[in-house]
Amino acid sequence: NFMYSKTVKRLSKLREYQQYHPSLTCVMEGKDIEDWSCCPTPWTSFQSSCYFISTGMQSWTKSQKNCSVMGADLVVINTREEQDFIIQNLKRNSSYFLGLSDPGGRRHWQWVDQTPYNENVTFWHSGEPNNLDERCAIINFRSSEEWGWNDIHCHVPQKSICKMKKIYI
């Protein structure tokens, strides 16, 4: 009876996500067979989050709306370890929007999920950000510094990275 009700709950939870994510990849968390964590296929997973690299070129606002439709946001990078994981899936000759912007052009950077902007946990390329008109952040590769962030015009199409919390069933 317990297993049956657990299965019913899982199925109803899966139905919630089916509209946008018809296929999930799930792994057992720890040793308890009851707990599974899932990411949409073909998203990648790191710690408690799922990541999707969008190769379509879109403006920052459109990229964020695109992530939102999938139940995600443009990526918020909280640690060096998280960035190191993300860059494994990026192409060196491309730039990708982050969920970081400065719409007022006053260098008040803000993350899309309202995570406080912490100057101590940022990975700007040297000399960046450098232009008050460039109000959205990308991550890109520079041969001298490897991967880092740069400010860029929000209306110019780029690739992007979406991030969502893992789905627990």
Partner: antibody, heavy 121, light 111 residues
């Protein structure tokens, strides 16, 4: 007073080249993104090229990409548009316009009087 | 590209009356309460002149009889009351993404 004055327009044969100039005054030219916008006779306005304030980025629509090059000389307060491989459909009045950024986009807050480019054999 | 469709293509208004021009975008030009639609006036033989930015903000020096409203895909420019000097073409423009695009224009004539 902000002023933008275009020059360099004229009659050119298909396949030919022209270089347009825009002399800016009355503001700190190096602090603003600048664009060229054109208007063919009786048609809507069409964006042609943008250059960022720091000269780090240039943008073009597909219709002119590879044929037109926007550049600027901040020391001379001047904006340029090099137009190569001109076609009949490039015939228009070409305006130089200053960009003012607002939130995630921008608008054109000052425009020059325009210079006419006619491409005809 | 985002397509902007203006209507009507032309209208004739008596002085003192209200003129209303609409601009419809093929997709939303709004994000988190910011509407990246702008309006310009162009008189014959002259360059465009900025009237309204970000849907409803009146550019400095523009008479208060001009106003703008709207969000997402539908925007309106209103001139109330119309004066003889308002004879011109009016254009909307979006800047939420490249390429920036303009509407086809609305010709306003004063009766």
């Amino acid at each position: 007073e902000v002023q933008l004055v275009e020059s360099g327009g004229g009659l050119v044969k298909p396949g030919g080249s022209l270089r347009l100039s825009c002399a800016a005054s009355g503001f700190t030219f190096s602090s603003y993104g600048m664009s060229w916008v054109r208007q063919a006779p009786g048609k809507r306005l069409e964006w042609v090229a943008t250059i960022s304030s720091g000269d780090s980025y240039t943008y073009y629509p597909d219709s002119v990409k590879g044929r037109f090059t926007i550049s600027r000389d901040n020391a001379k307060n001047s904006l340029y548009l090099q137009m190569n491989s001109l076609r009949a459909e490039d015939t228009a009045v070409y305006y130089c316009a200053r960009q003012l950024y607002y939130s995630y986009g921008y608008y054109f807050d000052y425009w020059g009087q325009g210079t006419t480019v006619t491409v005809s054999s | 590209d985002i397509v902007l469709t203006q209507s009507p293509a032309s209208l004739a208004v008596s002085p003192g009356q209200r003129a209303t021009i609409t601009c419809r975008a093929s997709e939303s030009v709004s994000f988190h309460g910011t509407h990246l639609m702008h309006w310009y006036q162009q008189k014959p033989g002259q360059p465009p002149k900025l009237l309204i930015y970000a849907a409803s903000n009146l550019e400095s020096g523009v008479p208060a009889r001009f106003s703008g409203s709207g969000s997402e895909t539908d925007f309106t420019l209103t001139i109330n009351p119309v004066e003889a000097e308002d004879t011109a073409n009016y254009y909307c423009q979006q800047s939420i993404e490249d390429p920036p695009t303009f509407g086809g224009g609305t010709k306003v004539e004063i009766k």
